[in-house]
């Protein structure tokens, strides 16, 4: 979280930002609120990012204002009008780029004051893990597969009745390059499982954290999965 | 759940003051704006103020400037308007309304002020 | 000021009827508009916000619609319930305005 006040003649106000992750090809989120102003003719809120030119968004008397934007963004931004009278400055931003990654700054005018705040945007690519029984293998072997990350991600395998054991040995990752040749697909298996335990595939990179689960018995499979962005730090 | 529970009914004498609260629940009181809005008998809506809690930061529609005070107290999330110089005219229903998702959204049940000799 | 005019200040309708009021500022707005229904004793009700949103719980009936200085809440098929007084308020500019009210009473 990132808090950040104004330095003006007039008051300042309090600006807020949360560090966040964007997934390339869609579409993302920069979080930024501030101390809401009954006045919305009156709000101005401006985007900008360290090393661009232009403009990323800038957001004034109750309209978007996209004279300045800077080419990298035409056409890829909005603000939530609706929600900018109640201190809503976020900015969505359409087909996320790996080129998107930066720092941002999040800067506020209203009748009140200025104020502004920064945000670490990162860029890569993650998804959620399947993780199935491989029935086309010699022994019983679980499939864990997710079609996009970057970078390169690493996989742990762990097990419920094996707590702490190393799978490294009894498992084998490959990365498959996708079709856009930057996002890769991947693939690991883990062999000589035995039944009545959770297997839990563990894919993570410096933005993301995902894990798929699988529990095997004689009578049932059961999945679970769940993804968690690592770096959502407020300012 | 959101919640704006206001006081109870008042009976002023002309040149007489009023103050009627507003006691809110369910979202931060002190990170937004709070609205004071009347309505006379048989007649539209009329705003009268805002105040945002966390600052005391008030505003003011020009017609009442100098007779309305609004106030707020961020231990009780409650917020007050106080009328002065009460006038037969200012017979009516007033409403504090608040602006958490957007504006005017949450309104509190009203409180009828009558101003009779 | 922003002066709204809203219009008509009432009509008479049958439920099932299509019904269409419509608000008028003195200037451009930029769709920072909201309507409100109102029943007799009861404080103004959250239905529509920024011209054309539906708050929660608000039944798909109810839409709004406009841009500049002309907007427009359009009931595609009134229902009993619907019988009240509707308001616009333009947040725009300050101070907040609203309209005059529309009544909409059973025909």
């Known amino acids: 979280l990132i808090i950040g006040f104004g330095i003006s003649g007039r008051h300042s106000i309090t600006v807020t930002t949360v560090a966040s992750a964007g997934n390339i090809g869609e579409d993302g989120i920069l979080s930024c609120t501030f101390e809401p102003d009954i006045k919305l003719s009156d709000i101005v809120i401006q985007w900008l990012k360290e090393g661009v030119l232009g403009l990323v968004h800038e957001f004034k008397e109750g309209k978007d204002e996209l004279s300045e934007q800077d080419e990298m963004f035409r056409g890829r931004t909005a603000v939530f009008a609706d929600q900018v009278i109640v201190g809503n400055a976020s900015l969505r931003l359409k087909n996320v780029q790996l080129t998107d990654a930066g720092t941002y700054k999040c800067y506020i005018i209203t009748s009140k004051g200025k104020g502004n705040a920064n945000l670490e945007y990162k860029t890569g690519a993650f998804s959620m893990p399947e993780v199935n029984v491989d029935y086309n293998a010699s022994s019983e072997t679980l499939r864990c597969e997710a079609p996009r990350w970057f970078p390169q991600p690493t996989v742990v395998w762990a097990s419920q009745v094996d707590q702490g054991a190393n799978f490294s040995e009894v498992s084998n990752t490959s990365f498959e390059l996708n079709s856009e040749n930057v996002t890769m697909k991947v693939v690991s298996v883990l062999y000589n499982v035995t039944i009545n335990n959770t297997y839990s595939c563990m894919i993570e990179n410096d933005i993301a954290k995902a894990t798929g689960d699988i529990k095997v018995t004689e009578s049932e499979i059961k999945r679970r999965s769940h993804l968690q962005l690592l770096n959502s730090k407020a300012s | 759940e959101v919640q704006l529970v206001q006081s109870g009914a008042e009976v002023k004498k002309p040149g007489a003051s009023v103050k009627v609260s507003c006691k809110v629940s369910g979202y931060p009181f002190t990170s937004y704006w709070m609205h004071w809005v009347r309505q006379a008998p048989g007649q539209g809506l009329e705003w009268i103020g805002a105040i945002y809690p966390g600052k005391s930061d008030t505003e003011y529609a020009p017609k009442f400037q100098g007779r309305v005070t609004l106030t707020a107290d961020t231990s009780t999330s409650t917020a007050y308007m106080e009328l002065s110089s009460l006038r037969s005219e200012d017979t009516a229903v007033y409403y504090c309304?608040?602006?958490?998702?957007?504006?005017?959204?949450?309104w509190g049940q009203g409180t009828t002020v009558t101003v009779s000799s | 000021d922003i002066q709204m005019t809203q219009s008509p200040s009432s009509l008479s309708a049958s439920v099932g009827d299509r019904v269409t009021i419509t608000c008028q500022a003195t200037?451009?707005?930029?769709?920072?508009l909201n309507w409100y229904q109102q029943k007799p004793g009861k404080p103004p009700k959250f239905l529509i916000y920024y011209t054309a949103q539906l708050a929660e719980g608000v039944p798909s009936r109810f839409s709004g619609s406009g841009s500049g200085t002309d907007y427009t809440l359009t009931i595609s098929s009134l229902q009993s319930e619907d019988f009240a007084t509707y308001y616009c308020l333009q947040f725009y500019e300050f101070p907040p305005t609203f309209g005059g009210g529309t009544k909409v009473e059973i025909k």
């Open positions: 200037q451009d707005i930029v769709k920072s």
């Open positions: 309304t608040s602006t958490w998702t957007h504006y005017f959204d949450y």
